[in-house]
C-alpha cells in the first residue's frame, strides 16, 4: 500500500524518500526488509539513513531490494516500503525504458523540462543537460534552476533529455543522472480561454432517486492541437478521485473536433443508483487550459 519504486545507476548517488508522511521531529528507522537488519545513520557508511531519506553514496547493483521505513510518530508507527533497483551503466547511449522518468510535453509557448528527483539532493547550479546523449549547446537552451527551457520549440526537439548534476555530501561529490522523454505538441491553430458548452451555469437537473443519471461537462478551448486542455468534474470542490463513492465515476475525457475546427473535450460523470444525499452535493464542471479556469455549477433535484 505504501510502497514506492526508485531506481538509479551504479556508481551514482541515489537518495530515496520514505513514502510515509513524517515530521521533522519524528525519528525514521530504516531496515533491509529481507533481513530486518537496521540501516545505520552514521554518514561514514556507503548506505545510510538520514531521517526521511535513505542515501546510497554511491549505489551498487547489490543494493537492489526492498527497504522498510518506520516513522516513529507518537501514537502509531507508520510503515512504508521503498523498492530500489540499481542498474549497471549502459555501454551505449541508449537509455532503457526502465530508467526513464515520466514523459513531459511541450509546445512553442511552454517548454520546461524539470530534472526528476533533484529536490532530494544537495546540488548546486548549473545543471548539465543532454539530448540523446549529446550535450546541449546554443542560446536556445537555458538551464534555469532545476529545469531546462527550450526557446522556439520545434518538432525535432522531441527526444530523451538527461540532466546531470553533482550531489555533495560532507565535502564528497557524487554524480547523478536522470532521463525523461520530451514530446512536442503541434500548435497550428490557437488557444483561448475555455468556453463551457454544457452544463449552463447554475443549472438544475431533475433526477429520480434509485435511477442512474449522467452529467456531461463539455468545453472548447480554441482550434487545433491544445497543449493543455482538461475537462473534469468536482464534487463539493474536491476531485472525483478523492471522493471514495464507487457509484459516482468520471469517464476519461473524450476529445471532439467540430467542422469549424474547434477543439472540444467532453467528460461524463456517471451516477448510479441516485441517492438522496447526492442531491446535497455541488457538481462543478471545470474547464482548464493555459489561459485559465472556467467553472459551471449544476445541482440535482428530485423529479416531482
Amino acid at each position: 500500500k505504501f510502497s514506492k519504486q526508485s531506481w538509479g545507476l551504479e556508481n551514482e548517488a541515489l537518495i530515496v524518500r520514505c513514502p510515509r508522511q513524517g515530521k521533522s521531529s519524528y525519528i525514521v528507522d530504516w531496515y533491509y526488509s529481507q533481513t530486518n537488519k537496521s540501516i545505520p545513520t552514521q554518514e561514514r557508511n556507503r548506505v545510510f539513513a538520514s531521517g526521511q531519506l535513505l542515501k546510497f553514496l554511491p549505489a551498487e547493483v547489490a543494493d537492489s531490494g526492498i527497504y522498510t521505513c518506520i516513522v516513529r510518530s507518537p501514537t502509531f508507527n507508520r510503515t512504508g516500503y521503498a523498492n530500489v533497483t540499481i542498474y549497471k551503466k549502459q555501454p551505449d547511449c541508449n537509455v532503457p525504458d526502465y530508467l526513464m522518468y515520466s514523459t513531459v510535453s511541450g509546445s512553442e509557448k511552454n517548454s520546461k523540462i524539470y530534472c526528476p528527483t533533484i529536490d532530494l539532493y544537495n546540488w548546486t547550479a548549473p545543471l548539465e543537460w543532454f539530448k540523446n546523449c549529446q550535450a546541449l549547446q546554443g542560446s536556445r537552451y537555458k538551464a534555469h534552476k532545476s529545469f531546462l527551457v527550450i526557446d522556439n520549440v520545434m518538432t525535432d526537439d522531441a527526444g530523451d533529455y538527461t540532466c546531470k548534476f553533482i550531489h555533495n555530501e560532507n565535502g564528497a561529490n557524487y554524480s547523478v543522472t536522470a532521463t525523461r522523454s520530451f514530446t512536442v505538441k503541434d500548435e497550428q491553430g490557437f488557444s483561448r480561454f475555455p468556453v463551457i458548452r454544457a452544463p449552463a451555469h447554475n443549472e438544475t437537473k431533475e433526477v429520480e432517486i434509485g435511477e442512474n443519471t449522467n452529467l456531461t461537462c463539455s468545453a472548447c478551448f480554441g482550434k487545433g492541437a491544445q497543449f493543455l486542455a482538461t475537462v473534469q468534474w468536482q464534487l463539493n470542490g474536491n476531485k472525483i478521485t478523492d471522493f471514495s463513492e464507487p457509484r459516482i465515476q468520471q469517464e476519461e475525457g473524450q476529445n471532439q473536433s467540430f467542422s469549424n475546427g474547434l477543439a472540444c473535450v467532453n467528460t461524463v460523470l456517471r451516477i448510479a443508483d441516485v441517492k438522496e444525499e447526492d442531491l446535497l452535493l455541488r457538481y462543478d464542471c471545470l474547464a482548464l487550459n493555459l489561459h485559465g479556469l472556467r467553472r459551471h455549477t449544476i445541482r440535482l433535484s428530485r423529479k416531482n
Partner: antibody, heavy 123, light 111 residues
Amino acid sequence: EVQLVESGGGLVQPGGSLRLSCAASGFTFSTFDMHWVRQVPGKGLEWISSIDTEGDTYYPGSVKGRFTISRENARNSLYLQMNSLRAGDTAVYYCTRGEDWSDDDYYYGLDVWGQGTTVTVSS
Amino acid sequence: NIVMTQTPLSLSVTPGQPASISCKSSQSLLHSDGKTYLFWYLQKPGQPPQLLIYGVSNRFSGVPDRFSGSGSGTDFTLKISRVEAEDVGVYSCMQSLQLFTFGPGTKVDIK
C-alpha cells in the same frame, strides 16, 4: 467554527450491525488523523479506532475484525462500520480529531470532540 | 499496553480552595521527539470531554489559568488553584505515546 457531528446511533440486537458517521466542518479534514472513542455509561473513556491521513487504520484488540473505520475526505466525513455487535459495545461513541500533518509542530492530542451518538445493543 | 491510573477517584472541594489530581503511567510517556504525550480532559455532566492540558503542562486555548499541569516520565499532576462551581465533572488523563489510553477519571464535586 470547528465542529464534529456524529450520527447513526440507535438500538440494535446482538450480532447486528450499525454504521456511525461523523461530519466535520471548520477545518481541513484531510490533513488530520481522526479517531473514535467510546464511553460506557458511568464508566471511563475507551479508544476504539483511528485512521491516519494516508488511510492506514488502527484498532485495539477488543474491536479488531468487527469494526472498520473509514474516511471520505471529499465529504469531510468519518465512518465507523460496526458488525457482530455485543452488549458490551453499548456506549456513547465520540468522533474526535487528532494530529494535524500539515503543521510540523502541531500536536494537541484529541482536541476537538463531537457531542456523541448513543449505541445500545440489546435484545 | 500503557496503563493509566489516577488518584483520588473522587474529590469534594470547597469553592475557592485548591485541588490536586495525580496520574501515573505504567511506562514513561517521553517520546524520541522530546515531547511527553500526556493530556488532561474535563468531562462536564452530559457533555463530551474537553481538552484542558496538552504536553503535560500546556494550557489549551480558552482554558483558565487556574488550571496547571506538571510532571515528567510516569508521574503527572493536575492542579486547580481555586476551584469554582463550573469546574465540577470528571477529570481524566490520557496518554498518546502508544495508541491511546485514558485514566479511570476523578470525579470532582463541590462541598
